[in-house]
Amino acid sequence: QPSCRQEEFLVGDECCPMCNPGYHVKQVCSEHTGTVCAPCPPQTYTAHANGLSKCLPCGVCDPDMGLLTWQECSSWKDTVCRCIPGYFCENQDGSHCSTCLQHTTCPPGQRVEKRGTHDQDTVCADCLTGTFSLGGTQEECLPWTNCSAFQQEVRRGTNSTDTTCSSQ
């Protein structure tokens, strides 16, 4: 059995040239004619040179999985799904996303260092000493309040709470 070259496929004991992306095999090669290819029908595709008798079905972006269609399927390219705003892709297979997760909400004591995108979760960072954050989508930690000369510091600030001052 012959081993075929790259971008050829085996038919019986003959090697046939593959079809171009966007096409599938309509008729395998013979003594005098090469591979006869046919364009992929709507909602199907082939992304690479291939020896397929049928094109592959285009992917569908499931809104229930937090997905939206970013790029429609073409005869040579599968549908590209992206996560809806506020979500990022957890499972990426090439250019295809199968599951999305909601962006992490930064907990109290942390700020948003890098906002979440369609393919990356939010990155949180701790507040430095002398600052605090209630968490959420806050991008800057706020400096603790300095109690005035007429106020007394009741409770020192933490990374998640401000200083408490009393006016007694």
Epitope: Q6, E7, E8, P17, M18, E31, G34, V36
Partner: antibody
Framework: EVQLLESGGGLVQPGGSLRLSCAAS????????MNWVRQAPGKGLEWVSI????????TYAQKFQGRFTISRDNSKNTLYLQMNSLRAEDTAVYYC?????????WGQGTLVTVSS | EIVLTQSPGTLSLSPGERATLSCRAS??????LAWYQQKPGQAPRLLIY???SRATGIPDRFSGSGSGTDFTLTISRLEPEDFAVYYC??????????FGQGTKVEIK
């Protein structure tokens, strides 16, 4: 003797239409796939379209899809190419050629000039 | 689509010399490659099909070799009538059938 004779070329304005014909003789026309190939002045060969022997399957190079239509009349041993929405860059000699793979016989060509 | 690249663009030789023309495909076309000769004001004429088979009536000084991506047309001894433009064409995977850009064989 196999003969292919194109006709129908000429001067046409941009946006206009033209129908080329290719009269075949000397072989069983209805048994062969037929092609149109064009050649712009001073340039190389460019495949345009193919039609199968019975005429029920046609294929085009992507750039001609929608503008050009290949057809055949096996009772008249004639191949046709209907060209619409012609552009200056369609100026070329248009050849009909016989064959599914290698093209073993060619006509002498007909010149199509698209100009205002 | 499969792109065919012919080299050299022009070949300047004298009658009686050997001409070697090259055609390279961007991916494998198997054995499904043809060579054509075209003279000014004339239609192309099929010389070689299936990479190595001579078409009807073609003199045996014309020969083809190669498979996959690399092909050669050899004219063993150039005759005056052989000075012309030569095109390779793949039909390994179609549509589209594609042609090389041509090699001109001129008299030195």
């Amino acid at each position: 003797e196999v003969q292919l004779l194109e006709s129908g070329g000429g001067l046409v304005q941009p946006g206009g239409s033209l129908r080329l014909s290719c009269a075949a003789s000397g072989f069983t026309f209805s048994s062969y796939g037929m092609n149109w190939v064009r050649q712009a002045p001073g340039k190389g060969l460019e495949w345009v379209s193919i039609i199968n022997p019975s005429g029920d399957t046609t294929t085009y190079a992507q750039k001609f899809q929608g503008r050009f239509t290949i057809s055949r009349d096996n009772s008249k041993n004639t191949l046709y190419l209907q060209m619409n929405s012609l552009r200056a860059e369609d100026t070329a000699v248009y050849y009909c050629a016989r064959g599914r793979g290698a093209f073993d016989y060619w006509g002498q060509g007909t010149l199509v000039t698209v100009s205002s | 689509e499969i792109v065919l690249t012919q080299s050299p663009g022009t070949l300047s030789l004298s009658p009686g010399e050997r001409a070697t023309l090259s055609c390279r495909a961007s991916r494998s076309v198997g054995k499904y490659l043809a060579w054509y000769q075209q003279k000014p004001g004339q239609a192309p004429r099929l010389l070689i099909y299936g990479a190595t088979s001579r078409a009807t009536g073609i003199p045996d000084r014309f020969s083809g070799s190669g498979s996959g991506t690399d092909f050669t047309l050899t004219i063993s001894r150039l005759e005056p009538e052989d000075f012309a433009v030569y095109y390779c064409q793949q039909y390994g995977s179609s549509p589209p059938v594609t042609f090389g850009q041509g090699t001109k064989v001129e008299i030195k």
